[in-house]
């Protein structure tokens, strides 16, 4: 098979016919050295998945449930292209499965037992698989057959297509459980009508159902959504209050050697020539031979799935949890309201060792998961492989965009008795230079720069945000002659100054010697002209406070701060000479784990926090000899956030605006995936 050929998998005679037509029409519009289509016919979508995994085919389009099957080992396929619906300007690639209730009712998600339920149909995503999957562990045992367990959980239901003879309670609200529009409560609109008519207390539908059935806002205001955290929100707030986000229809390919760029090139060309209203002789999104062949007839086009987005991220934690519960039928032995151990995400080797020590001292209440970069850790928290970690504000922003929430803030200045309940204003991001140099904020061009890491607040977002507004382009590697900004492209001049050692050169973790606050300052000491760090970095690493060979003889007076007005000041005057105020680092977690993480951490800091005086013979949570492992070493306590419990509120409008502006320069694959 030529390497420019995409072998499309078809699952019926009609699909195979359309595939051949697709192949022939693409041949007529693409150059001979461009991508081509070959057709492979299989008996089912599962056979197609296996064929792609075995390298007998390259691509197929699947519904969400099958994307889950495709991702499971040994298939290991990944989403590469998504169909979108709606307009090109506002493309919809996902819908949200929601639980709708009347505003005048007074129960929450964890109080559904004994209520009456309205479903779109047996085995359907939004109406059955997702809600029942998420409720699975609350269903009465035995949970098999599932229909019986559901019938015993709710006091009455309408589940179109269920067996009314065996499970009469499932048809209590719609006698016979009719499986077509003859049943007034069938499908999305029907399930909503079941709620509207007062037959049921809750309807499991998709987010658009309410808008499609109630054009009038005043009417919509009579309804609310049940959220997984046992609160309610208005029907407009479905993005923050849903049971799961469900991808509509997706092209999958192999994770390794999957030809994803070729598949995208092919489909992008295909939508240009044969997309909606493009051609009379062949239409990608319709067919005379049948409905939804190869692609959905309702699709309007394709979008490339960002490369960082694997199937776990694409399907989302809630969706995977629901489907896994249904498929595997396993539930934790502990009651679900009891906090399980919290899995902390540790960055590379050094943090993992400290985490292991913490785990032992916590008697197993903390467990450890590792990743090589902060973004990989955030992704692990998103998909449930880990639960929490403490992050610099720049990463709190990325984590927030990825659906995580801040849980506790690191406090650096508040003495102990009041610390836990105090909201600090933040720390200062500063630019440090050697006193002997003649540098100012205005003549940094062509100099050597040292950064904590790309994407971090003091080391990147603030200085580069200020620089961007001055130079109006993102080519920071051309502005500085060279530098060390861990996380930059390895061949960039902003990796040139990094120290490594070799395989870890410029990696955004502690294996890179110039990573983090202390690392960026060391970079200035040994090689650089300017370091972008926090205001405490110089005092914490001079005057013998850092015993490492490179730092032990350093004097604070040999360093100065650059002020934005072009002047310079002593490192003792950050309040009058800083680039911006930075939000304190904060612990983040998934919403469903936030309360457990908070409770456990407050308990852990009482045992291992700054009240421990002898860290040589006791475990100390906030100590790692200037390495800032797991938490900043200058943390006094972890403080409650009170109402600052979203990333926007925590970071503040000004900082969010600054980082959002800098997004046009973003090199964050995770941010790209989370905003897809």
């Amino acid at each position: 098979v030529p390497e420019k050929s995409v072998r499309w998998c078809a699952v019926s005679e009609h699909e195979a016919t359309k595939c051949q037509s697709f192949r022939d029409h693409m041949k007529s519009v693409l150059p001979s050295n461009g991508p081509s289509v070959a057709c492979v016919k299989k008996a089912s979508h599962l056979d197609c998945i296996r064929a792609i995994a075995a390298n007998e085919a390259d691509a197929v389009t699947l519904d969400a449930g099958l994307v889950y099957d495709a991702y499971l080992a040994p298939n290991n396929l990944k989403p590469v292209v998504a169909e979108f619906y709606g307009s090109k300007e506002d493309p919809q690639t996902f819908y949200y499965a929601v639980a709708v209730v009347k505003k005048d009712s007074d129960f929450q998600m964890n109080q559904l037992r004994g209520r009456k339920s309205c479903h779109t149909g047996l085995g359907r995503s939004a109406g059955w698989n997702i809600p029942i999957g998420l409720l699975y562990c609350d269903l009465p045992e035995p949970r098999k057959p599932l229909e019986k367990a559901v019938a015993n959980f709710f006091s009455g239901s309408c589940v179109p297509c269920a067996d009314g003879t065996d499970f009469p309670q499932l048809c209590q609200l719609c006698p016979g459980c009719g499986c077509s529009t003859l049943n007034q409560y069938f499908s999305y609109s029907g399930a909503f009508k079941c709620l509207k008519d007062g037959a049921g207390d809750v309807a499991f539908v998709k987010h658009s159902t309410i808008f499609e059935n109630l054009a009038n806002k005043a009417d919509r205001d009579q309804y609310e959504l049940l959220c997984l955290d046992n609160t309610r929100k208005s029907v407009d707030e479905y993005k923050d209050c849903h049971l799961a986000r469900v991808p509509s229809h997706t092209v999958v390919a192999r994770s390794v050697g999957g030809k994803e760029d070729l598949i995208w090139e092919l489909l992008n060309q295909a939508q240009e020539h044969f997309g909606k209203d493009k051609s009379k002789e062949f239409q990608l999104f319709s067919s005379p031979h049948g409905k939804d062949l190869l692609f959905k007839d309702s699709a309007h086009g394709f979008l490339k799935v960002p490369p960082r987005m694997d199937a776990k991220m694409y399907l989302g934690y809630e969706y995977i949890t629901a489907i896994r519960n249904l498929r595997e039928g396993t539930c934790p032995e502990a009651p679900t309201d009891e906090c399980k151990p919290v899995k902390w995400c540790a960055l590379s080797h050094h943090e993992r060792l400290k985490c292991d020590e913490w785990s032992v001292n916590s008697a197993g209440k903390i467990e450890c998961e590792s990743a090589e970069t902060t973004e990989d850790c955030i992704a692990k928290i998103m998909n449930g492989e880990a639960d929490a970690m403490s992050l610099d504000g720049g990463f709190v922003y990325i984590a927030g965009m990825c659906g995580l929430v801040p849980v506790l803030a690191e406090n650096y200045n508040t003495p102990n008795p009041n610390c836990e309940n105090t909201a600090e204003e933040g720390y200062f991001a500063v630019a440090v230079v050697k006193s002997s140099s003649d540098l100012t904020w205005d003549n940094l061009k062509g100099k050597k720069s040292c950064h904590t890491a790309v994407g971090r607040t003091a080391g990147w977002n603030i200085p580069m945000g200020l620089l961007y507004s001055k130079i109006n382009h993102c080519r920071f590697d051309e502005f500085f002659s060279e530098g060390c900004a861990p996380g930059s492209e390895k061949n960039s001049s902003l990796c040139k100054l990094c120290m490594g050692p070799s395989p870890n050169l410029c990696e955004p973790n502690n294996k890179e010697g110039y990573y983090g606050y202390t690392g960026a300052f060391r970079c200035l000491v040994e090689k650089g002209d300017v370091a972008f760090v926090k205001h405490q970095t110089v005092p914490q690493n001079t005057g013998g406070k850092n015993p490492d060979a490179w730092a032990k003889n350093l004097k604070e007076e040999d360093y100065e701060l650059l002020c934005l007005d072009g002047s310079r000041k002593s490192v003792q005057e950050p309040a009058n000479c800083h680039l911006a105020r930075a939000p304190n680092h904060a612990v983040v977690a998934r919403k469903d784990k936030a309360d457990c993480v908070q409770t456990l951490l407050l308990d852990q800091q009482r045992m291992f926090g700054s009240s421990v005086t002898d860290c040589s013979s006791n475990f100390c949570l906030f100590e790692s000899k200037t390495k800032d492992l797991l938490f900043r070493d200058d943390t006094v306590c972890l403080a409650k956030l009170h109402d600052r419990n979203t990333y926007e509120k925590y970071l503040g409008e000004e900082y969010v605006k600054a980082v959002t502006n800098l997004r046009k320069c973003s090199t964050s694959p995770l941010l790209e995936a989370c905003t897809f």
Epitope: H349, H350, E351, L353, K354, E357, V360, N361, A363, C615, S616, S617, N618, F619, C620, E623, S624, K625, K627, L629
Partner: nanobody, 117 residues
Framework: EVQLVESGGGLVQPGGSLRLSCAAS????????MAWYRQAPGKGLEWVAG???????NYRDSVKGRFTISRDNSKNTMYLQMNSLRAEDTAVYYC???????????WGQGTLVTVSS
């Protein structure tokens, strides 16, 4: 800084037992936490078990009920009693004391445990 030396490894059949020792050149009395790690051929380093100064212990799931960690502060020694050994326990075993707070990259020679019939 305390220097640690591991011993007690060897070849053992599946289901057999071994007792590893970790001897310290200085006093371990004041050391907060000690632990055993292992590295199987071609794999990364993984934590096996840990013990606090007061004697609280914690184990990775796959060794719970089979391995027992203990320490004798008067002899400046930590132990790992390994029972019901399996082929997947084959690895070089290292001990660490965490005491430097640098969470260093420096490990001793370790002691090789081979479980094979």
């Amino acid at each position: 800084e305390v220097q640690l030396v591991e011993s007690g490894g060897g070849l053992v059949q599946p289901g057999g037992s071994l007792r590893l020792s970790c001897a310290a050149s200085g006093s371990i009395f004041s050391i907060a936490t000690m632990a055993w790690y292992r590295q199987a051929p071609g794999k990364g380093l993984e934590w096996v078990a840990g013990i606090t100064r007061s004697g609280s212990t914690n184990y990775r799931d796959s060794v719970k009920g089979r391995f027992t960690i203990s320490r004798d502060n008067s002899k400046n020694t930590m132990y790992l009693q390994m029972n019901s050994l399996r082929a997947e326990d084959t690895a070089v075993y290292y001990c660490t004391d965490y005491s430097s707070r640098y969470y260093h990259d420096y490990w001793g020679q370790g002691t090789l445990v081979t479980v094979s019939s």
